[in-house]
């Protein structure tokens, strides 16, 4: 008799694919054309990358600095009116992506929550809740709640009132701590939180350490979903040597848990990179006119357009990469082990029940190293066979699809590869 | 122009509830939050509560055992009750616009409590 | 709660003189701080939010200063008109709570 199947995990669709951040509208869609209409526009785009969710904003009215001159409620006319909104969520919705609204506050201004003293912002937070969840949006994201006091406390309100309005609605929030402690403090209160935190770009980037922060946060979190970004708004680009940026897109999507990437990531998109541009939001390289100001300033290969048309690109390992995560069982919920590997690799298994499993072999190093993988702390049901095929390297040079021996694995300078293999009984 | 006006009985016996209605003109009801403020005579103003067109609400600990107040969209009204009046709760009773601050107030009503 | 302190319940003043009412917050406030003006009969009028920001049609001579727990209304070359009580409010916290006023008399 055949062994029989494990039963599947509840899945919300956060569980399903990447989250896509969106925090300025205008950087993301160009000189002058930044509104929700022109967003719109833009979804297919979205769909490209096969995200899940958007998360936009704020897009509220806000002053900087000024309590009297925020609305949470109101839109900022100069991103639209509430009936452009309206009409993107309908779109969003027919393209199968989700939309969560930012609701920082003071997001304009030095202090995002104004100040640790004030809570009168905090206090009308859970009306804008109310009201956004009766517009249709699918989840909310606030940053930086170590500036908000009793954030604990105020979380715990809000996930209330969006899961008491469908448990398919998501609460993001966002803090500048890498401290897991904290984190785990603020995890605590909120059984479905997702959190964006500094946490993983707290490393000397080697595959010891970035290792042993993954397990030790896996580890502190237990079996609670979690998120995997480097910070809780910015570039990869902000955090990450060039040269790393294939790789973290790699581990990101195949670890357990949502990846939450930010606009400009899939492409490598610098932080201040062209003169003239904002550090926080660069503005989108679409093609070589997104920066009429310079001539000759934006290169092809920096660009959507150029990456698109090259299948070596990030931008195509960004969409090889999505694609795998939102539909292989193993990677979408699957169990998680490392194992022992060479000094400077970082690598691990996922697999579920018996569908075909994935292995994850990510070198950190400078220079080019045998794998020695060693599957002895591995639990047999995750035992590794002599050979895997190739899904994917984060380098060129590799046959896709070709069978690799694992015993003789060797890997290049920086280089990632995603295997898989068959489940045998 | 947003303009705003209180209606209800002048006169409540102790012990009864105090009822109020204010309706909005000149702008929607909708997206805004709508409060209650109170000054007895010869002292200053009471903050009563606020509540936002979904029903959500926001009342004063000091009064929240008392106090109900409800929003009829439809109508653009909103409402306060407050049970268990005492000679105490006399006063000029107003309805604003609350943006933190108060932009837009009602002419106010006064409302005594006495058998 | 925050208690807004206005501690002279009355100010005299002349026609043309400039003159100053003050509150005071019991706990830190930020510039979370509004100032109204009440006449009698009549309901309470906006004249400063943001502790400095003048509401809009609120004559210049009226100008608000301060942050933190210390608030000023000044009113510059007072005019007849402005004989009324003036009370601050703070929003930085629910419940949101006023000063009890300050009653502006002309000499």
């Known amino acids: 008799r055949a062994p029989r199947c494990r039963e599947l995990p509840a899945q919300k669709w956060w569980h399903t694919g990447a989250l896509y951040r969106i925090g300025d509208l205008q950087a993301f869609q160009g000189h002058g054309s930044g509104n929700l209409a022109g967003l719109k526009g833009r979804l297919d785009y979205l769909s490209s990358l096969k995200v899940k969710g958007l998360v936009l904003g704020p897009l509220h009215k806000n002053q900087k600095d000024d309590v009297a001159q925020t609305d949470l409620l109101q839109i900022d006319p100069n991103f639209g009116s509430k009936e452009d909104f309206d009409n993107l969520l309908q779109s969003a919705k027919k393209k199968s992506i989700r939309v969560i609204l930012d609701l920082t506050p003071n997001y304009r201004g030095e202090n995002l929550w104004f100040s640790t003293q004030v809570d009168s912002v905090a206090t009308k937070v859970k009306d804008a809740l109310e009201f956004w969840l009766q517009a249709g949006v699918d989840g909310f994201q606030v940053r930086d709640i170590e500036n908000l006091k009793d954030a604990s406390s105020f979380l715990a309100e809000w996930e209330n009132i969006t899961k008491g309005f469908s448990e398919d609605r998501l609460l993001i929030a966002g803090t500048n701590s890498s401290d897991l402690q904290q984190i785990v403090s603020l995890l605590e209160s909120n059984k479905d939180l997702l959190l964006t935190s500094s946490y993983l770009s707290d490393s000397s980037f080697t595959g010891e350490h970035t290792k042993s922060l993954v397990t030790q946060y896996l580890n502190a979190t237990g079996n609670r979903w979690c998120s995997w970004s480097l910070s809780q708004a910015g570039l990869l680009t902000s955090f990450l040597p060039a040269q790393l940026l294939r790789l973290y897109q790699l581990m990101l999507f195949t670890l357990p848990g949502t990846p939450v990437f930010s606009y400009g990531d899939e492409i490598g998109l610098k932080a201040a990179a062209l003169p003239g541009q904002p550090v926080e939001a660069p503005v989108m390289l679409w093609d070589e006119s997104s920066f009429p100001d310079i001539p000759g300033a934006v290169s092809a290969n920096m660009t959507v357009k150029g990456q698109s048309e090259d299948p070596g690109s990030l931008l195509s390992l960004f969409r090889q990469l999505s694609d795998q995560r939102s539909k292989e069982r193993s990677l979408l919920h699957g169990d998680f082990h490392t194992f022992s590997s060479g000094p400077g690799l970082f690598s691990y298994i996922r697999h579920w029940d018996q569908n075909e499993r994935f292995l994850v072999v990510l070198n950190f190093g400078d220079v080019g190293l045998s794998a020695g993988l060693q599957a002895s702390d591995l639990p047999a049901s995750a035992s590794l066979p002599t050979k895997a095929d190739l899904v994917l390297s984060t380098q060129p040079g590799r046959e896709e699809g070709s069978p690799l021996e694992l015993e003789r694995l060797k890997l290049e300078p920086h280089e990632g590869l995603l295997l898989r293999f068959p489940y045998v009984a | 122009q947003v303009q705003l006006q209180e209606s209800g009985p002048g006169l409540v016996k102790p012990s009864e509830t105090l009822s109020l209605t204010c309706t909005v003109s000149g702008g929607s009801i909708s997206s805004s939050y709508w409060s209650w403020i109170r000054q007895p005579p010869g002292k200053g103003l009471e903050w009563i509560g606020y509540?936002?067109?979904?029903?959500?609400?926001n009342y004063n600990p000091s009064l929240k055992s008392r106090v109900t107040i409800s929003v009829d969209t439809s109508k653009n009204q909103f409402s306060l009750k407050l049970s268990s009046v005492t000679a105490a709760d006399t006063a000029v009773y107003y309805c604003?616009?609350?943006?933190?601050?108060?932009?837009?107030w009602g002419q106010g009503t006064l409302v005594t409590v006495s058998s | 709660d925050i208690v807004m302190t206005q501690s002279q319940k009355f100010m005299s003043t002349s026609v043309g003189d400039r003159v100053s009412v003050t509150c005071k917050a019991s706990q830190n406030v930020g510039i979370n701080v509004a100032w109204y003006q009440k006449k009698p009969g009549q309901p309470p009028k906006a004249l400063i939010y943001?502790?400095?920001y003048r509401y809009s049609g609120v004559p210049d001579r009226f100008t608000g200063s301060g942050s933190g727990t210390d608030f000023t209304l000044t009113i510059s070359n007072v005019q007849s008109e402005d004989l009324a009580e003036y009370f601050c409010q703070q929003y930085n916290s629910y419940p949101l709570t006023f000063g009890s006023g300050t009653k502006l008399e002309i000499k």
């Open positions: 509540i936002y067109n979904s029903g959500s609400t």
């Open positions: 604003a616009r609350e943006t933190y601050y108060f932009d837009y």
């Open positions: 943001s502790a400095a």
